[in-house]
């Protein structure tokens, strides 16, 4: 178990022209956040694809406003670190996606609007425990500088932060061949993660019981030289089963860092820092190139120019961002009028229109009541693209032209009889039955069940239905 | 329980050698991850790392000083002796050894128990 | 080298104070590892791996930090805490300690 932290250093316009415009405005202050992504390993997986390894959320910045005329600056950053913890084994190998995200806060309806500023996306190769690493990332006209590292929660310790200390299963004593786990004394060591005897300055492992040799080494345990015109050099005593010579006793002597890296003594091995564009155990490994698959979605890769760009993608339509990791987000032009929803199909944009309004971009205004008028007293009432009245009693229709029949509907009950009125109608009910729809029966003794009739009226009378 | 003990000569003339032996009990250097470690301190100073070796015979010497260290051990006498050549007053401090302990292939979990010390003076 | 710089040198403070102590790395180290000692004692381990409590001592000292930047915190000072204490990095070679903080009775 352990936990990857991220930290923003600095969001701001990109080095060259065409300086990106402030996101924020007096008009429109905003704030930005920031959202991290992680999957394992080197595989080829498209933006949208799950975050296995983990996710977060960094808090927001504080608000920035920007100054009339000034060009847009770094911007204010949230503070702390981005931590995604992770609870098993380290992968060693994983792809990143950064977002950086602007938060309006105008006079926003339902509160604040988030709109996605920036997208960076990268794979990279990282030892938990390691120190700081430090990348700069583009994202059309910005730049984003950021450092990052895997760190474990102790007792888990190692490159994978693989837990090497368990509790004791009996309160006495450790199981056969395991010691405890001072100065953690309830805790007793697990077998080591890398093959017993696998030499600490010349093999590493990735996987529990492995032992892998570094260039230059061999044998089971990475203890044999490999014979080379190297061994010609004299570095160290003189090897009886290769010829060769095995080099001092210090593991930076002959300095095993590749391509100008400076080696430093762990305690029990040895590390390299390595110079910008290469990394690896030994900074063998140069920065990232098409080989290891940087272009997400179908983006082609080509070969950069220059070091600090040692490859170009060059996207599919529908996509853009470095590493072809962005959607074009055609969206963000807002073309559907009118308070319309857009829909990216990728192949066509579409536009979900409000009430009253169509046309492929909302643009057409179908106001229900403008240069309509309702007849006889109705009242207009807008809605749903479709104008509609409200009638005055006695009246009905689209426009309230026609005159209503209010007994057309048989309102009166158990065979009463209806009588069209100029105030609406009344039910002459028949014998037995009262109410204003002759709705309730009167029982044999005169009173009736609900509710009592009305003062001045007998059960019989007709009920005028008001 | 784990003790462990420093001896060795309490005056040494300065272009002299320095010989301490660390003797110890309560866990062995031939149980992987185990380590012991020597540490200085002149009086009235901080803490110096000096040297320290491993149960797989693995080796640290400070850089600053590699020249004139040694470390070696003798597993089966539960001893480590370290010798510092050509001291020099400047040398005059208190000697620890203590024990370090490595869980995996490269990170020191502790540096949990420490001999008592021995103040070794260095003068003609 | 990885200079290691504790902050205050020294301090004092009284029985039932809240002490912290910090240790500034030059460089970025993984773990962060806390020694106490008393005059004419050995130096005991209080804190390894950074916030781990060695085999004996109270619950009231407590370790935190990341990178370079590191904290020893004593909850509830108590009489017999009174020592010098010291950080120590195990990154890289030489493995050196802080130059101490000093935690005198006022």
């Known amino acids: 178990a352990g936990v990857f932290e991220l930290q923003i250093h600095s969001f701001g316009p990109g080095p060259g022209p065409g300086a990106p415009r402030s996101p924020c405005s007096a008009r429109l202050p905003c704030r930005l956040f920031f959202r991290v992504c992680l999957k394992p390993g080197l595989s080829e997986e498209a933006a949208e694809s799950p975050c296995a390894l983990g996710a977060a959320l960094s808090a927001r910045g504080p608000v920035y406003t920007e100054q009339p005329g000034a060009p847009a600056p770094d911007l204010p950053l949230p503070d702390g670190l981005l931590q995604v913890p992770f609870r098993d084994a380290w992968p060693g190998t994983f792809s990143f996606i950064i977002e950086t995200w602007r938060e309006e806060l105008g006079d926003q309806i339902g509160g604040p609007a988030w709109s996605l500023l920036a997208r960076v996306a990268g794979r990279r190769r990282l030892a938990a425990g390691g120190p700081w690493a430090r990348d700069i990332q583009r994202a059309g006209a910005w730049e984003l500088r950021f450092s990052y590292r895997a760190r474990c929660e102790p007792p888990a310790v190692g490159t994978a932060c693989t837990r090497l200390c368990r509790p004791r299963s009996a309160p006495s004593r450790c199981g056969p061949g395991l010691r405890p786990c001072a100065p953690l004394e309830d805790e007793c060591e697990a077998p080591l993660v890398c093959r017993a005897g696998c030499s600490p300055e010349h093999g590493f492992c990735e996987q529990p019981g492995e032992c892998r040799c570094l260039e230059g080494w061999t044998g089971p345990l990475c203890t044999v030289p490999v014979s080379t015109s190297s061994c010609l050099s004299p570095r160290g005593p003189s090897s009886a089963t290769t010829g060769c010579l095995v080099p001092g006793p210090g593991p930076c002597d002959g300095n095993p860092c590749a391509n100008g890296g400076s080696c430093s003594e762990t305690p029990r091995s040895f590390e390299c820092t390595c110079p910008r564009g290469f990394y690896g155990l030994r900074c063998e490994v140069s920065g990232v190139t098409c080989a290891d698959g940087p272009c997400f979605n179908g983006g082609l890769c080509v070969g950069g120019a220059d070091p600090d760009s040692a490859y170009i993608c060059h996207c599919p339509p529908g996509f853009q961002g470095s590493n072809c990791e962005k959607r074009v987000d055609r969206c963000s032009l807002q073309p559907c009028r009118n308070g319309g929803l857009c829909l990216d199909l990728g192949h066509a944009l579409r536009c979900r229109c409000r009430a009253g309004f169509a046309g492929p971009r909302c643009e057409h205004d179908l106001d229900d009541c403008a240069g309509r008028a309702c007849a006889n007293g109705g009242t207009c009432v807008e809605g749903g693209g479709a104008h509609r009245c409200s009638c005055a009693l006695g009246f009905g229709g689209r426009d309230c032209r026609e005159r209503a029949d209010p007994c057309a509907a048989r309102p009166c009950a158990h065979g009463g009889r209806c009588y069209a009125h100029f105030s609406g109608l009344v039910c002459a009910c028949a014998p037995g039955y009262m109410g204003a729809r002759c709705e309730f029966p009167v029982h044999p003794d005169g009173a009736s069940a609900l509710p009592a009739a009305p003062p001045g009226l007998r059960p019989g009378d007709p009920q005028r239905y008001l | 329980q784990i003790t462990l003990k420093e001896s060795g000569p309490t005056l040494v003339k300065p272009t002299q050698t320095l010989t301490l032996t660390c003797t110890f009990s309560g866990f062995s250097l031939s149980t992987s991850g185990m380590g012991v470690g020597w540490i200085r301190q002149p009086p009235g100073k901080a803490l110096e790392w000096l040297a320290h070796?491993?149960?797989?015979?693995?080796?640290r010497y400070s850089p600053s000083l590699k020249s004139r260290l040694t470390i070696t051990k003798d597993t089966s006498k539960n001893q480590v002796v370290l010798t510092m050549t050509n001291m020099d007053p400047v040398d005059t401090a208190t000697y620890y050894c203590?024990?370090?302990?490595?869980?995996?292939?490269?990170?020191?979990?502790?540096?949990?128990?420490w001999g008592q010390g021995t103040l070794v003076t260095v003068s003609s | 080298d990885i200079q290691m710089t504790q902050s205050p040198s020294s301090l004092s403070a009284s029985v039932g104070d809240r002490v912290t102590i910090t240790c500034s790395a030059h460089?970025?180290?993984?773990?962060m590892y806390w020694y106490q000692q008393k005059p004419g004692k050995a130096p005991k381990l209080l804190i390894y791996l950074t916030s781990n409590l060695a085999s004996g001592v109270p619950s009231r000292f407590s370790g935190s930090g990341s990178g370079t930047d590191f904290t020893l915190t004593i909850s509830s000072l108590q009489p017999e805490d009174f020592a010098t204490y010291y950080c120590q990095q195990w990154r890289s070679n030489p493995f050196t300690f802080g130059q101490g903080t000093k935690l005198e009775i006022k």
């Open positions: 460089s970025s180290v993984s773990y």
């Open positions: 070796i491993w149960w797989d015979d693995v080796k």
């Open positions: 203590a024990r370090i302990v490595s869980f995996d292939n490269d990170v020191v979990s502790a540096m949990d128990y």
